[in-house]
Protein backbone atom coordinates (compact mmCIF):
# COMPACT_ATOMS: atom_id res chain seq x y z
CA UNK A 1 0.00 0.00 0.00
CA UNK A 2 1.42 3.56 -0.78
CA UNK A 3 0.79 7.20 0.31
CA UNK A 4 -0.74 8.91 -2.88
CA UNK A 5 0.99 11.97 -2.39
CA UNK A 6 4.13 11.87 -0.07
CA UNK A 7 4.61 15.81 -0.65
CA UNK A 8 1.79 17.02 1.24
CA UNK A 9 3.27 21.28 0.41
CA UNK A 10 1.07 21.22 -2.75
CA UNK A 11 -1.98 21.98 -0.98
CA UNK A 12 -5.48 21.13 -2.98
CA UNK A 13 -7.42 24.82 -3.12
CA UNK A 14 -9.83 24.70 -0.11
CA UNK A 15 -13.35 23.00 -0.89
CA UNK A 16 -16.19 24.77 -1.58
CA UNK A 17 -17.68 22.81 2.04
CA UNK A 18 -17.84 24.62 5.07
CA UNK A 19 -18.81 24.32 8.38
CA UNK A 20 -18.04 25.52 12.35
CA UNK A 21 -15.79 23.32 14.15
CA UNK A 22 -17.82 22.14 17.54
CA UNK A 23 -15.25 22.78 20.52
CA UNK A 24 -12.88 22.77 18.53
CA UNK A 25 -12.92 20.02 16.83
CA UNK A 26 -14.47 19.00 13.21
CA UNK A 27 -16.35 15.63 11.92
CA UNK A 28 -15.53 12.78 10.14
CA UNK A 29 -14.74 13.88 5.99
CA UNK A 30 -13.28 17.02 7.18
CA UNK A 31 -10.42 19.11 8.55
CA UNK A 32 -10.17 22.22 10.22
CA UNK A 33 -8.85 25.75 8.14
CA UNK A 34 -5.70 27.29 8.43
CA UNK A 35 -7.52 30.35 11.13
CA UNK A 36 -9.41 27.23 13.34
CA UNK A 37 -13.02 28.59 12.15
CA UNK A 38 -14.09 26.72 9.96
CA UNK A 39 -14.59 23.00 9.02
CA UNK A 40 -13.26 22.43 5.54
CA UNK A 41 -14.75 18.63 3.86
CA UNK A 42 -12.04 16.56 2.25
CA UNK A 43 -12.37 15.65 -1.45
CA UNK A 44 -13.99 12.39 -2.25
CA UNK A 45 -11.31 9.75 -3.48
CA UNK A 46 -8.18 11.99 -2.38
CA UNK A 47 -8.39 11.92 1.55
CA UNK A 48 -10.42 11.58 4.13
CA UNK A 49 -10.87 12.22 7.76
CA UNK A 50 -12.26 9.36 10.03
CA UNK A 51 -12.54 10.91 13.29
CA UNK A 52 -13.69 14.40 14.80
CA UNK A 53 -10.53 15.62 14.42
CA UNK A 54 -8.40 19.54 14.48
CA UNK A 55 -6.64 18.22 11.40
CA UNK A 56 -5.06 21.01 8.93
CA UNK A 57 -5.16 18.33 6.17
CA UNK A 58 -7.17 15.59 5.75
CA UNK A 59 -5.29 12.61 5.39
CA UNK A 60 -4.67 11.23 1.71
CA UNK A 61 -6.24 8.45 0.50
CA UNK A 62 -3.98 5.24 -0.39
CA UNK A 63 -3.87 3.08 -3.65
CA UNK A 64 -3.62 -0.42 -3.60
CA UNK A 65 -0.30 -1.64 -5.17
CA UNK A 66 -0.05 -3.98 -7.87
CA UNK A 67 -0.34 -7.55 -6.41
CA UNK A 68 -3.57 -6.19 -4.21
CA UNK A 69 -7.39 -5.99 -4.73
CA UNK A 70 -9.35 -2.73 -4.01
CA UNK A 71 -12.24 -4.30 -1.67
CA UNK A 72 -13.75 -0.84 -1.31
CA UNK A 73 -12.82 3.06 -2.34
CA UNK A 74 -12.06 6.09 -0.15
CA UNK A 75 -14.37 8.09 0.55
CA UNK A 76 -14.35 11.03 2.70
CA UNK A 77 -14.69 9.26 5.86
CA UNK A 78 -12.80 6.14 5.16
CA UNK A 79 -9.51 5.21 3.78
CA UNK A 80 -9.53 2.28 0.92
CA UNK A 81 -9.46 -0.72 1.97
CA UNK A 82 -7.04 -3.02 0.13
CA UNK A 83 -6.57 -7.09 -0.17
CA UNK A 84 -4.12 -9.28 -1.39
CA UNK A 85 -5.41 -11.02 -4.95
CA UNK A 86 -5.75 -14.85 -4.41
CA UNK A 87 -3.21 -17.25 -4.22
CA UNK A 88 -1.16 -14.41 -1.98
CA UNK A 89 -1.36 -12.97 1.84
CA UNK A 90 0.30 -10.28 3.76
CA UNK A 91 1.79 -11.58 7.23
CA UNK A 92 1.53 -8.95 10.38
CA UNK A 93 4.97 -8.32 10.70
CA UNK A 94 5.88 -7.59 7.09
CA UNK A 95 2.07 -5.89 5.87
CA UNK A 96 4.34 -3.75 3.31
CA UNK A 97 3.98 -6.61 0.38
CA UNK A 98 1.88 -9.36 -0.48
CA UNK A 99 3.60 -12.73 -0.75
CA UNK A 100 3.04 -15.85 -2.31
CA UNK A 101 0.97 -18.45 -0.55
CA UNK A 102 2.75 -22.10 -0.83
CA UNK A 103 1.83 -24.21 -2.73
CA UNK A 104 1.30 -27.70 -0.44
CA UNK A 105 3.07 -29.16 2.42
CA UNK A 106 6.31 -30.74 2.69
CA UNK A 107 6.13 -35.18 3.11
CA UNK A 108 4.59 -36.30 6.49
CA UNK A 109 2.98 -32.80 6.74
CA UNK A 110 -1.18 -32.12 5.83
CA UNK A 111 -2.71 -29.05 5.12
CA UNK A 112 -5.01 -27.72 8.20
CA UNK A 113 -5.40 -24.42 7.02
CA UNK A 114 -5.67 -22.85 3.28
CA UNK A 115 -3.86 -19.84 1.71
CA UNK A 116 -6.32 -16.43 3.10
CA UNK A 117 -5.57 -12.31 1.73
CA UNK A 118 -4.01 -12.67 5.58
CA UNK A 119 -1.92 -16.27 6.19
CA UNK A 120 -0.32 -19.03 4.18
CA UNK A 121 -1.49 -22.83 3.91
CA UNK A 122 -1.13 -23.89 7.52
CA UNK A 123 0.33 -27.42 7.71
CA UNK A 124 0.90 -29.76 10.35
CA UNK A 125 2.73 -33.21 10.95
CA UNK A 126 0.50 -35.96 10.28
CA UNK A 127 1.48 -37.95 13.35
CA UNK A 128 2.03 -35.21 16.20
CA UNK A 129 -0.23 -32.46 14.72
CA UNK A 130 2.66 -29.46 15.28
CA UNK A 131 2.69 -26.52 13.26
CA UNK A 132 5.35 -25.99 10.60
CA UNK A 133 6.94 -22.81 11.02
CA UNK A 134 8.56 -21.21 8.42
CA UNK A 135 8.68 -21.32 4.63
CA UNK A 136 8.64 -24.63 2.67
CA UNK A 137 9.23 -24.70 -1.07
CA UNK A 138 8.80 -28.40 -1.18
CA UNK A 139 5.37 -29.76 -1.87
CA UNK A 140 4.34 -32.74 -0.69
CA UNK A 141 4.90 -34.79 -3.75
CA UNK A 142 8.28 -32.61 -4.26
CA UNK A 143 10.30 -32.50 -1.65
CA UNK A 144 13.56 -31.76 -2.53
CA UNK A 145 14.91 -27.65 -1.63
CA UNK A 146 16.08 -25.68 -4.34
CA UNK A 147 19.94 -24.43 -3.77
CA UNK A 148 20.29 -22.10 -1.00
CA UNK A 149 16.71 -22.57 0.41
CA UNK A 150 17.18 -25.12 2.95
CA UNK A 151 13.88 -26.86 4.48
CA UNK A 152 13.03 -25.01 7.60
CA UNK A 153 12.97 -26.52 11.43
CA UNK A 154 9.43 -27.38 12.81
CA UNK A 155 9.08 -26.62 16.14
CA UNK B 1 8.48 19.52 29.78
CA UNK B 2 9.44 21.27 26.69
CA UNK B 3 10.12 25.08 26.23
CA UNK B 4 10.61 26.90 23.62
CA UNK B 5 12.20 30.22 22.89
CA UNK B 6 11.79 31.65 19.47
CA UNK B 7 13.76 34.71 18.73
CA UNK B 8 14.82 36.69 15.20
CA UNK B 9 11.75 38.93 14.84
CA UNK B 10 12.00 42.78 14.06
CA UNK B 11 10.73 45.41 11.78
CA UNK B 12 11.03 44.78 7.89
CA UNK B 13 10.07 46.65 5.05
CA UNK B 14 7.71 45.26 2.52
CA UNK B 15 9.38 42.48 0.50
CA UNK B 16 12.37 42.18 3.25
CA UNK B 17 12.95 38.95 4.94
CA UNK B 18 13.51 37.32 8.32
CA UNK B 19 14.53 34.08 10.12
CA UNK B 20 12.66 32.83 12.88
CA UNK B 21 14.63 30.63 15.19
CA UNK B 22 12.73 28.63 18.07
CA UNK B 23 15.36 26.57 20.70
CA UNK B 24 13.98 24.00 22.24
CA UNK B 25 14.96 22.15 25.42
CA UNK B 26 13.95 19.79 28.37
CA UNK B 27 13.12 17.18 25.03
CA UNK B 28 14.19 14.86 22.93
CA UNK B 29 14.11 17.35 20.11
CA UNK B 30 14.15 15.10 17.27
CA UNK B 31 11.30 13.39 18.10
CA UNK B 32 8.99 16.46 18.22
CA UNK B 33 6.82 17.34 15.40
CA UNK B 34 6.67 21.23 15.13
CA UNK B 35 4.97 23.95 13.62
CA UNK B 36 4.86 28.20 13.48
CA UNK B 37 1.80 29.47 14.00
CA UNK B 38 0.93 33.36 14.24
CA UNK B 39 -1.63 36.11 15.52
CA UNK B 40 -2.01 39.41 14.28
CA UNK B 41 -3.07 42.30 16.36
CA UNK B 42 -6.96 42.01 17.27
CA UNK B 43 -7.36 38.43 15.51
CA UNK B 44 -6.93 34.68 16.22
CA UNK B 45 -4.23 32.20 15.85
CA UNK B 46 -3.30 30.89 12.20
CA UNK B 47 -1.16 28.15 11.59
CA UNK B 48 1.62 29.14 9.45
CA UNK B 49 3.42 26.19 8.49
CA UNK B 50 4.65 22.32 9.92
CA UNK B 51 7.66 19.87 9.98
CA UNK B 52 7.99 16.28 11.02
CA UNK B 53 10.52 15.22 13.29
CA UNK B 54 12.48 13.67 10.72
CA UNK B 55 11.72 16.64 8.30
CA UNK B 56 10.21 14.78 5.61
CA UNK B 57 7.12 16.00 5.81
CA UNK B 58 6.26 19.45 5.16
CA UNK B 59 3.08 21.93 5.87
CA UNK B 60 2.57 25.47 4.65
CA UNK B 61 -0.67 27.78 4.75
CA UNK B 62 -1.32 28.80 1.27
CA UNK B 63 -0.75 32.45 2.15
CA UNK B 64 2.97 31.79 2.76
CA UNK B 65 3.58 29.55 0.12
CA UNK B 66 6.18 29.98 -1.99
CA UNK B 67 7.34 32.54 0.63
CA UNK B 68 8.13 30.88 3.67
CA UNK B 69 10.34 27.98 4.58
CA UNK B 70 10.73 25.70 7.61
CA UNK B 71 13.27 23.61 8.39
CA UNK B 72 14.93 22.52 11.62
CA UNK B 73 18.39 21.41 12.52
CA UNK B 74 18.07 18.56 15.03
CA UNK B 75 21.81 18.59 16.01
CA UNK B 76 21.24 22.47 17.31
CA UNK B 77 17.62 21.60 18.70
CA UNK B 78 16.60 24.48 16.88
CA UNK B 79 13.75 25.26 14.59
CA UNK B 80 13.51 28.11 12.18
CA UNK B 81 11.16 29.54 9.44
CA UNK B 82 12.60 31.77 6.88
CA UNK B 83 10.74 34.57 5.53
CA UNK B 84 10.66 36.39 2.44
CA UNK B 85 8.96 38.62 0.49
CA UNK B 86 7.27 40.06 3.64
CA UNK B 87 3.71 41.59 3.41
CA UNK B 88 2.24 44.13 5.40
CA UNK B 89 -0.17 41.16 6.50
CA UNK B 90 2.74 39.22 7.81
CA UNK B 91 2.65 41.50 10.81
CA UNK B 92 1.78 39.55 13.99
CA UNK B 93 3.28 37.22 16.84
CA UNK B 94 4.95 34.28 15.57
CA UNK B 95 4.83 31.38 17.93
CA UNK B 96 6.53 28.23 17.37
CA UNK B 97 4.52 25.09 18.83
CA UNK B 98 5.20 21.72 19.21
CA UNK B 99 2.25 19.04 18.41
CA UNK B 100 2.21 16.06 21.63
CA UNK B 101 -0.44 14.31 20.20
CA UNK B 102 0.95 13.96 16.76
CA UNK B 103 -1.37 12.23 13.61
CA UNK B 104 0.64 9.89 11.60
CA UNK B 105 -0.94 7.89 8.92
CA UNK B 106 1.10 5.76 6.68
CA UNK B 107 4.17 7.13 7.85
CA UNK B 108 3.11 10.44 7.23
CA UNK B 109 2.76 13.29 9.77
CA UNK B 110 -0.47 15.17 9.73
CA UNK B 111 -0.41 18.71 12.10
CA UNK B 112 -3.25 19.65 14.31
CA UNK B 113 -4.43 22.98 14.89
CA UNK B 114 -4.49 22.34 18.51
CA UNK B 115 -0.37 21.80 18.89
CA UNK B 116 0.07 22.04 22.74
CA UNK B 117 3.52 23.17 23.85
CA UNK B 118 3.91 26.84 22.93
CA UNK B 119 6.63 29.39 22.57
CA UNK B 120 6.40 33.33 24.27
CA UNK B 121 6.17 34.41 20.78
CA UNK B 122 8.45 36.88 18.56
CA UNK B 123 6.91 40.22 17.19
CA UNK B 124 7.27 40.49 12.93
CA UNK B 125 6.25 44.12 11.92
CA UNK B 126 6.34 44.68 8.38
CA UNK B 127 5.93 48.91 7.39
CA UNK B 128 6.97 51.05 4.79
Known amino acids: ITQQDLAPQQRAAPQQKRSSPSEGLCPPGHHISEDGRDCISCKYGQDYSTHWNDLLFCLRCTRCDSGEVELSPCTTTRNTVCQCEEGTFREEDSPEMCRKCRTGCPRGMVKVGDCTPWSDIECVHKESGTKHSGEVPAVEETVTSSPGTPASPCS | EVQLLESGGGEVQPGGSLRLSCAAS????????MGWFRQAPGKGREFVSA????????YYAESVKGRFTISRDNAKNTLYLQMSSLRAEDTAVYYC?????????????????????WGQGTLVTVKP
Open chain 2, 51 to 58: ISRSGDNI
Open chain 2, 26 to 33: GSTFSSLD
Open chain 2, 97 to 117: AVDTQPTYSGGVYYPRYGMDV
